[in-house]
Interface confidence: low
């Protein structure tokens, strides 16, 4: 190899050992039969050399540094060449370094040709191994602006007082152009300005200077984002630290063209703006740090640019001003994330404060909009408390449990609407009366409607789930002893069309001791499947539930149990079932932990089924499934 450097080139070449690898055979640079492990070539020198091994790239690296002095004479602006040409260099990992010194008053701009640059953070690397490292200067201190790969959005970086630019090329890479040019600009009066150009959807992750170490004290750094007018941008902070300020406050400032409040100032811990149309600037301003305990300021953030859906141009008013004790949350559905670029999905309050989830509370009107590629990625959960504190005032009072029509105007699917129904202990109980009779969801007869009501105890210490119920069955009402939550859960978008089928009325009624009472009027055409609460986990200890089963005059009811025995084993007490004819009050009592369950039996009149549990041994719980069918009476047995 021969490397000749012109005298006025200001280029020095250094060949040195790279990262040592445990190779059996050492390798040397050979110059005039002399073996060395380092070679420095200065301007005006011409050196012939070879390597003593077949694969010098495993041993050596080459650094080519060009010093550009803009202090003492004119600055050579324009496209930066790779000198010496890569074809004249040995095939080693090579780093081209340009060190530009300029006056404080002169701005220097690095311009990157397409495919532009993508900043990467600690622990990351570039797929093709081509890396740009860019540093600036504050007086004598070097400041790392960042390390970058190809294929990104960074198109220009402006600095002043000097730039150090290093381009690292792997030995096998055919690249023979620098990919950037240098231009002079007026003073930028800050550490640097990074321009990031988006041509379409995408995201960019960017970092403060010196990241992950601290941002220089009391400095200012600006990012300029060029966003097509038809797209929307959102900023989210991925990682930040604040230093200990003695004077001034660390902050970010947004300059958003067209905004009447420029610059918009945010603390780093604030929710950052989203749904921004058009170009904008973001600046990070440091503070005067405490000399004894400075701490560090650092910031890593992401800008996400995407197409607005039709919905993102619409403002939705959610009027909760007349609601009490209500909260509405819009949040992402749980999904497996793919590893490729997924556009963000945000919900925005007043069109500007955007986040992946948002909770609205009662007492006011809220204006929201969406910035999301696909609104089915979001759903809505609502909670409402209906409580009674004075039993004399509440008794016989009724409330309609209906999803407010305002919620149907939102373009997001409702997942759960939960009512927490709270009563004074041992004073009042509750009765739920559906607009349409309900069916209990069982494995044997599952619900296939677009929504169900999930009824469960709302007493923290009590694990009692009454079941899932949907319209189109035989349950006329459900009475419960104490606090419960009723959750309307939707299973299909068609809920909007079926919404008229929803509707429960809750009334406060005099207190009773049973945990729950189901009033059932079987349908003549189908089996009614019923099961004990807490199916699969067992009816809680010492809990009692009843079913009031009506039998029409002209019908006979057949009561059938799914199993021969319950399988419950009592640790203390007894588990029993009472079947009582309502007309004659005649009753039969079955010991559930000893007796077999009754064979299918016929009832000509309305009857009660009451089940009371013992304290079961673990793993030997009480679960009971039974069904009722009606058949016409053939002989009048009254």
């Amino acid at each position: 190899f021969e490397i000749a450097l012109p005298r006025e080139s200001n280029i020095t070449v250094l060949i040195k050992l790279g990262t040592p690898t445990l190779l059996a055979k050492p390798c040397y640079i050979v110059i005039s039969k002399r073996h060395t492990t380092m070679l420095s070539i200065k301007p005006g020198e011409r050196i012939l050399f070879t390597f003593s091994c077949q694969s010098p790239e495993n041993h050596f690296v080459i650094e080519i540094q060009k010093n550009i002095d803009c202090m003492s004479g004119p600055c050579p602006f324009g496209e930066v060449q790779l000198q010496p040409s890569t074809s004249l260099l040995p095939t080693l990992n090579r780093t081209f370094i340009w060190d530009v010194k300029a006056h404080k008053s002169i701005g220097l701009e690095l311009q990157f040709s397409i495919p532009r640059l993508r900043q990467f953070g600690p622990g990351e690397s570039c797929p093709d191994g081509v890396t740009y490292s860019i540093s600036g200067r504050i007086d004598a201190t070097v400041v790392r602006i960042g390390t970058f790969c190809s294929n990104g959005t960074v198109s220009r970086i402006k600095m002043q007082e000097g730039v150090k630019m290093a381009l690292h090329l792997p030995w096998f890479h055919p690249r023979n152009v620098s990919g950037f040019s240098i231009a002079n600009r007026s003073s930028i009066k800050r550490l640097c300005i990074i321009e990031s150009v988006f041509e379409g959807e995408g995201s960019a992750t960017l970092m403060s200077a010196n990241y992950p170490e601290g941002f220089p004290e009391d400095e200012l750094m600006t990012w300029q984002f060029v966003i097509p007018a038809h797209l929307r941008a959102s900023v989210s902070f991925l990682n930040f630290n604040l230093s200990n300020c003695e004077r001034k406050e660390e902050r970010v400032e947004y300059y958003i063209p067209g905004s009447t409040t420029n610059p918009e100032v945010f603390k780093l811990e604030d929710k950052q703006p989203g749904n921004m149309a058009g170009n904008f600037n973001l600046s990070l301003q440091g503070c005067d740090q405490d000399a004894q305990n400075p701490g560090i300021l650092r910031l890593q953030f992401q800008v996400l640019v995407q197409h607005p859906q039709n919905e993102s141009n619409k403002i939705y008013v959610v009027d909760l001003s007349n609601e009490r004790a209500t909260s509405l949350t819009i949040e992402p559905r749980p999904v497996k994330q793919s590893r490729k670029f997924v556009p963000g999905c945000f919900v925005c309050l007043e069109s500007r404060t955007c986040s992946t989830n948002l909770t609205l509370t009662s007492g006011s009107k809220h204006k929201i909009s969406f910035l999301c590629d696909n609104l089915t990625r979001l759903w809505m959960n609502v909670e409402k408390n209906i409580s009674c504190t004075d039993h004399r005032y509440c008794q016989r009072k009724s409330y309609s449990l209906q999803v407010p029509s305002d919620i149907f105007h939102l373009p997001v699917e409702l997942h759960d609407f939960s009512w927490k129904l709270l009563v004074p202990k041992d004073r009042l109980s509750l009765v739920l009366v559906p607009a349409q009779k309900l069916q209990q969801h069982t494995h044997e007869k599952p619900c296939n409607t677009s929504f169900s009501y999930l009824v469960a105890s709302a007493i923290p210490s009590q694990d009692l789930y009454f079941g899932s119920f949907c319209p189109g069955g035989s349950i006329e009402q459900i009475q419960v002893k104490q606090n419960i939550s009723v959750t309307l859960r939707t299973f299909a978008p068609s809920f909007r069309q079926e919404a008229s089928r929803q509707g429960l009325t809750v009334s406060f009624i005099p207190y009773f001791k049973e945990e729950g009472v189901f009033t059932v009027t079987p349908d003549t055409k189908s089996k009614v499947y019923l099961r004990t609460p807490n199916w699969d986990r067992g009816l809680p200890s010492l809990t009692s539930v009843s079913w009031n089963i009506s039998v029409p005059r002209d019908q006979v009811a057949c009561l059938t149990f799914f199993k021969e025995r319950t399988g419950v084993v009592c640790q203390t007490g007894r588990a029993f079932m009472i079947i009582q004819e309502q007309r004659t009050r005649a009753e039969e009592i079955f010991s559930l932990d000893e007796d077999a369950l009754p064979k299918p039996r016929f009832h000509h009149h309305s009857f009660w089924v009451n089940i009371s549990n013992c304290s079961p041994a673990s793993g030997k719980q009480l679960d009971l499934l039974f069904w009722v069918t009606l058949t016409p009476r053939t002989v009048d047995l009254t």
């Epitope: 495919p115 990104g152 150009v197 988006f198 041509e199 097509p228 007018a229 197409h307």
Partner: antibody
Framework: EVQLVESGGGLVQPGGSLRLSCAAS????????IHWVRQAPGKGLEWVAS????????SYADSVKGRFTISADTSKNTAYLQMNSLRAEDTAVYYC?????????WGQGTLVTVSS | DIQMTQSPSSLSASVGDRVTITCRAS??????VAWYQQKPGKAPKLLIY???SLYSGVPSRFSGSRSGTDFTLTISSLQPEDFATYYC??????????FGQGTKVEIK
């Protein structure tokens, strides 16, 4: 009413030059990407170049890089496509289009024929 | 560059038929896909943007959908004025914009 009107097409010899204009009305050109798209006779659509004049941003298809230059005069609300070193394969109808939700407005097109 | 492979290149259909045209992107383009209709001697017209959003003024019989890198344009009930050539187009991120090869819908 939004409108784009192309002009400047015609017959030119290989190696020659032409400058196409795209006059926009009904909107401010500097707020939008303007694209040039061409269609060779009997063929499909091919994107040529784009400009976002508010940030002096330009982009080109590989097939025209170094030969074509896109520019805009915001005071005239007009975009241009300067075509140098023209080749026979550049023969096409050239359309300018505005990008908002996709390319939502197109000009009527101007025919460029490169032939000796 | 990202290739958009459109199929079929042509199809024959009758008025009232349901017509489906597909486009496959050679890599992820998110939802940055648009569909255009072009009639002979005329400039293309935008039908669908962002993969599935109907552009204003376009009849609702046109719809678009996305499944990963596969995009579909559907005409639910073909009308006489729908006989034309249809193109898909991607404009994802910093990649050059590319069109599909086109699908000519002819009268059976």
């Amino acid at each position: 009413e939004v409108q784009l009107v192309e002009s400047g097409g015609g017959l030119v010899q290989p190696g020659g030059s032409l400058r196409l204009s795209c006059a926009a009305s009904g909107f401010n050109l500097s707020y939008y990407y303007i694209h040039w798209v061409r269609q060779a006779p009997g063929k499909g659509l091919e994107w040529v170049a784009s400009i976002y004049s508010s940030s002096s941003y330009t982009s080109y298809a590989d097939s025209v890089k170094g030969r074509f230059t896109i520019s805009a005069d915001t005071s005239k609300n007009t975009a241009y496509l300067q075509m140098n070193s023209l080749r026979a394969e550049d023969t096409a109808v050239y359309y300018c289009a505005r990008a908002y939700y996709g390319f939502d407005y197109w000009g009527q097109g101007t025919l460029v024929t490169v032939s000796s | 560059d990202i290739q958009m492979t459109q199929s079929p290149s042509s199809l024959s259909a009758s008025v009232g038929d349901r017509v489906t045209i597909t486009c496959r992107a050679s890599q992820s383009v998110s939802s940055a896909v648009a569909w255009y209709q072009q009639k002979p001697g005329k400039a293309p017209k935008l039908l669908i943007y962002s993969a599935s959003s109907l552009y204003s003024g376009v009849p609702s019989r046109f719809s678009g959908s996305r499944s990963g890198t596969d995009f579909t344009l559907t005409i639910s009930s073909l009308q006489p004025e729908d006989f034309a050539t249809y193109y898909c187009q991607q404009s994802y991120y910093y990649y050059p914009i590319t069109f599909g090869q086109g699908t000519k819908v002819e009268i059976k």
